[in-house]
């Protein structure tokens, strides 16, 4: 299936903001009537964009984190790369998004 960039919005009850992903989603609001008409979605591409957007949002909210007294609130950080430290909330969002993509792919209609 041809890959194109789309805006994917999680359901209202999901704990992540609108993020970009590669892949075509005919239905982008979670499970509802007709939402099995999906084409391939990519976890790897999505993770890349999720990280970009969430880190971007994080910088907007806390541009001067180095000045915060609680900057070291999370002492153990998991590195996706040598440059990008991920705090637990971000790891949680990534896991949730992986779950969403697996669920969406499991809900795909088989096209003959």
């Amino acid at each position: 299936a041809p890959m194109k960039e789309a805006n994917v919005h999680g359901q209202g009850n999901l704990a992540y903001p609108a993020v970009r992903t590669h892949g075509t989603l005919e239905s982008v609001n979670g499970p509802r009537a007709g939402s099995r008409g999906l084409t391939t979605t990519s976890l790897a591409d999505t993770f890349e964009h999720v990280i970009e957007e969430l880190l971007d949002e994080d910088q907007k909210v806390r541009p001067n984190e180095e000045n915060h007294k609680d900057a070291d609130l999370y002492t153990s950080r998991v590195m996706l790369s040598s440059q990008v430290p991920l705090e637990p909330p971000l790891l949680f969002l990534l896991e949730e998004y992986k779950n969403y993509l697996d669920a969406a792919n499991m809900s795909m209609r088989v096209r003959r």
Partner: antibody, heavy 115, light 107 residues
Amino acid sequence: EVKVVESGGGLVQPGGSLRLSCATSGFTFTDYYMSWVRQPPGKALEWLGFIRNKANGYTTEYSSSVKGRFTISRDNSQSILYLQMNTLRAEDSATYYCAITMDYWGQGTSVTVSS
Amino acid sequence: DIQMTQSPASLSASVGETVTITCRASGNIHNYLAWYQKKQGKSPHLLVYNAQTLADGVPSRFSGSASGTQYSLKIDSLQPEDFGSYYCQHFWSTPFTFGSGTKLEIK
């Protein structure tokens, strides 16, 4: 027409190995997640695991009951899904089903683990 | 892991009656739930997906609903071919566990 046909079941001794196959046709195999599910005699359905599609790197997930013993793989050139089962136990006796997403299921193949 | 608690385990009903089967998820599965019909010696047959969407070719007497973490399958005006076992399965975070099943028998 979408077709899903499992094969490879049979009688095997405890501790032995068996490889199940699931031959498919009628759809673009690489676009879809493929799953294995089993049902022991008189018991409920049990999800064993899946292998993701091409876009998601053909990565796998397993249930804790088979992780480390069972391996799901796929031959994308022939549109075949496999389930390699090692260190088989009596409790692995069941009918094994292969499924395309949740949509199409094969007729199942029976596995009996007994000495 | 998310557990699916299905009830009742068995159910006896007559042709023409309405029955409801429920599954409760131990966590939020965001409506990613399917219902299957399973007959002896046959493969599972998808009835409902995403909690309330009817699969292709499934009669309209079947319907799915959701309320919080509780999911229901209702069968109106039971037909002879509806008897068999029914299972729910969630698709939110692996493992994608099934409910324990409901055996629907003819009264």
